[in-house]
């Protein structure tokens, strides 16, 4: 039977992809989340839709990815922002856009920024506007660590599976 | 002999890199393609030049990467665009730049966007201009899936091996 | 004892992360470097601070990463630039920002660009300004290869562990 002897998430993977013959021994924790397009003024990560998945121990809790085993992980995220004409009223000052992946660990009592990207856009001067932000890197993480994101400019997000996402995989 | 018992692409790899002692059991499918700089108004991917390669089953067909075995892959791509203003009239209309990695699968009868980045540039206002776009993420892919790209703004591509590329590797 | 029988860098990893049970056989070369924030007009990579690390053979010499074993590596880097206009005259001349990962190999007598990103900013028109640049890809590297970076716009770097970094890991 597809998925027999696999972890629940791996079994789910095998069911979704019947051609995939996944040996549990070769599986590595991996996750890919997408921004929920039905939530316009917040960024809620979803794992149960489109191309998103949680595999081999990764779980999603309180909008954070929980690291299943200690090791080195590649962590990545992307956002796309957009805006229309005349959205700024009585200002020509720029709009601050930022996206950050943060680590909350038992080792530290606060959120540690792992990946940060920033942009100033001048929506009153250039309209419509679009901006993409991507980053990713390798980090030593510990079982139970929480990976989350913080975004400045959420009302301007272009929420689709291919534009706003967040993921990690063990190396 | 270098490359004995390896797949053709792995054997080619071993020949190119004589110091590499590649055990077939540890090889994983990987590919890195670069945009053909001799084709100015199209984006044709090349695997047989510069730092580009196809390894352990990946192949390039109809400008698409063919996924050799089912599993989770990290897929990535970058483009760099540049331009000069054509005329003062360019101030009124922005140039839409976009780059997308798409999946064509037996499971779906259409191209599914996996990775999308977008930008509006205002060539009449800021000349010359340059813009880079990068994205990458992990996806569950099935043997035979086709990975391709779609780009808006192809005439503005800065085609070099280090600026325009497309790749994937199995996790 | 934690780290017994491991390479020095792996032992250091195990000590830093006591919950990590690292079997040497599963370790793969990996490195993540951050830009030294105490050096404002240069980009010096550091491995002994914050989230940075060198594992399983990677070393840092002359501001370059030395590739420990031949194989395919994913190489990545990010920079964030920022600035304010100095004077209205700044409107006339754009600022060229670029970041490149380069390979110096025994096979070639010069630095080969692997990853390049570029941007023109117009600081007199839009102030303050912020711009992020990221890129990463898979490359076939040979033991002893040197990976380094070249940056145009160093005085404008936003030097923090989450904004300016450079890394690689074996696939």
């Amino acid at each position: 039977l597809p998925g027999v002897g696999l972890t629940p998430s791996a079994a789910q993977t095998a069911r979704q992809h019947p051609k995939m013959h996944l040996a549990h021994s070769t599986l590595k924790p991996a996750a890919h989340l997408i921004g929920d397009p039905s939530k316009q003024n917040s960024l809620l990560w979803r794992a149960n839709t489109d191309r998103a998945f949680l595999q081999d121990g990764f779980s999603l809790s309180n909008n954070s990815l929980l690291v299943p085993t200690s090791g080195i992980y590649f962590v990545y995220s992307q956002v796309v922002f957009s805006g229309k004409a005349y959205s700024p009223k009585a200002t020509s000052s720029p709009l601050y856009l930022a996206h950050e992946v943060q680590l909350f660990s038992s080792q530290y009592p606060f959120h540690v920024p792992l990946l940060s990207s920033q942009k100033m856009v001048y929506p009153g001067l250039q309209e419509p506007w679009l901006h993409s932000m991507y980053h990713g890197a390798a980090f030593q993480l510990t079982q139970g660590d929480q990976l989350s994101t913080h975004t400045d400019g959420i009302p301007h997000l272009v929420l689709s599976p291919s534009t706003v996402f967040f993921g990690a995989f063990a190396l | 002999l270098p490359g004995v018992g390896l797949t053709p692409s792995a054997a080619q790899t071993a020949r190119q890199h004589p110091k590499m002692h590649l055990a077939h059991s540890t090889l994983k499918p990987a590919a890195h393609l670069i945009g053909d700089p001799s084709k100015q108004n199209s984006l044709l991917w090349r695997a047989n030049t510069d730092r580009a390669f196809l390894q352990d089953g990946f192949s390039l067909s109809n400008n698409s990467l063919l996924v050799p075995t089912s599993g989770i892959y990290f897929v990535y791509s970058q483009v760099v665009f540049s331009g000069k203003a054509y005329s003062p009239k360019a101030t009124s209309s922005p140039l839409y730049l976009a780059h997308e990695v798409q999946l064509f699968s037996s499971q779906y009868p259409f191209h599914v966007p996996l990775l999308s980045s977008q930008k509006m540039v205002y060539p009449g206002l800021q000349e010359p201009w340059l813009h880079s776009m990068y994205h990458g993420a992990a996806f569950q892919l099935t043997q035979g899936d086709q990975l391709s790209t779609h780009t808006d703004g192809i005439p503005h591509l800065v085609l070099s091996p280090s600026t325009v590329f497309f790749g994937a590797f199995a996790l | 004892l934690p780290g017994v029988g491991l390479t020095p860098s792996a032992a250091q990893t195990a000590r830093q992360h006591p919950k990590m049970h690292l079997a040497h056989s599963t370790l793969k070369p990996a490195a993540h470097l951050i830009g030294d924030p105490s050096k404002q007009n240069s980009l010096l990579w550091r491995a002994n601070t914050d989230r940075a690390f060198l594992q399983d053979g990677f070393s840092l010499s002359n501001n370059s990463l030395l590739v420990p074993t031949s194989g395919i590596y994913f190489v990545y880097s990010q920079v964030v630039f920022s600035g304010k206009a100095y004077s209205p005259k700044a409107t006339s001349s754009p600022l060229y920002l670029a970041h490149e990962v380069q390979l110096f190999s025994s096979q070639y007598p010069f630095h080969v660009p692997l990853l390049s990103s570029q941007k023109m900013v117009y600081p007199g028109l839009q102030e303050p300004w912020l711009h992020s640049m990221y890129h990463g890809a898979a490359f076939q590297l040979t033991q002893g290869d040197q990976l380094s970076t070249h940056t145009d716009g160093i005085p404008h770097l936003v030097l923090s562990p989450s904004t300016v970094f450079f890394g690689a890991f074996a696939l």
Epitope: N41, K89, A90, T91, S92, L95, L125, D152 | - | -
Partner: antibody, heavy 114, light 113 residues
């Protein structure tokens, strides 16, 4: 409902300091600049400066540079104006505003007098 | 700094009158980037905060009655109230947001005749 609410005004001695708060609610705060504008009794509007809460970037009216300091706490959706070396002519209603959306607070009166 | 000069400084009018207030800037407020003028008009009533009426010189803010309109470009701008209503008696300010520091006109007080 979107609101900007100033607080912290009151009577201050000449040479003294005060910190005004501007609490935002009903919209995401960090991406949009908060401007500070003041109005002396019976006079017109005077722009003090602005802060981008997310980035920490600031722009000051040169007339206030050195005496005014802007800051923000994104976790509290609140911007602050610290004014030092206060003089009688600093007596005014101080407003915070978000020009991007066109929101203004109700203002807080600062009186500098001995 | 850009100087903003409003005229008149005060005016008396009756309900139903057409009222025009002008605002001159010491340099152009036209952004070449978007061909828009960085000028706003505010209405302020005694003891209240200013209320945004017009931005980018001619765009009415949401909820602002259609009798208010803004026009002009470069250095010369006009706020027009086509038919003055009792609730329109207030002080009106123009403001430039083309460059720093942002500056306001000295105000025009519209009083009941």
């Amino acid at each position: 409902e979107v609101q900007l609410v100033e607080s912290g005004g009151g009577l201050v001695q000449p040479g003294g300091s005060l910190r005004l708060s501007c609490a935002a609610s009903g919209y995401t705060f960090s991406s949009y600049w908060i401007e500070w504008v003041r109005q002396a009794p019976g006079k017109g509007l005077e722009w003090v400066g602005e802060i981008s809460p997310g980035s920490g970037s600031t722009n000051y009216n040169e007339e206030f540079k050195g005496r005014a300091t802007f800051s923000a706490d994104n976790s509290k959706n609140t911007a602050y104006l610290q004014m030092n070396s206060l003089r009688a002519e600093d007596t005014a209603v101080y407003y915070c505003a978000d020009g991007y959306h066109g929101y203004w607070g109700q203002g807080t009166l600062v009186t500098v007098s001995s | 700094d850009i100087q903003m000069t409003q005229s008149p400084s005060s005016l008396s009018a009756s309900v139903g009158d057409r009222v025009t207030i002008t605002c001159k800037s010491s340099q152009s407020l036209l952004y070449s980037t978007n061909q828009k003028n960085a000028l706003a008009w505010y209405q302020q009533k005694p003891g209240k905060a200013p209320k945004l009426l017009i931005y980018w010189a001619s765009t009415r803010d949401s909820g602002v009655p259609s009798r208010f309109s803004g026009s002009g470009s470069g250095t010369d701008f006009t706020l027009t109230i086509s038919s003055l209503q009792p609730e329109d008696f207030a002080t009106y300010y123009c403001q430039q947001y083309y460059s720093y520091p942002r500056t306001f006109g000295q105000g025009t007080k519209v009083e009941i005749k």
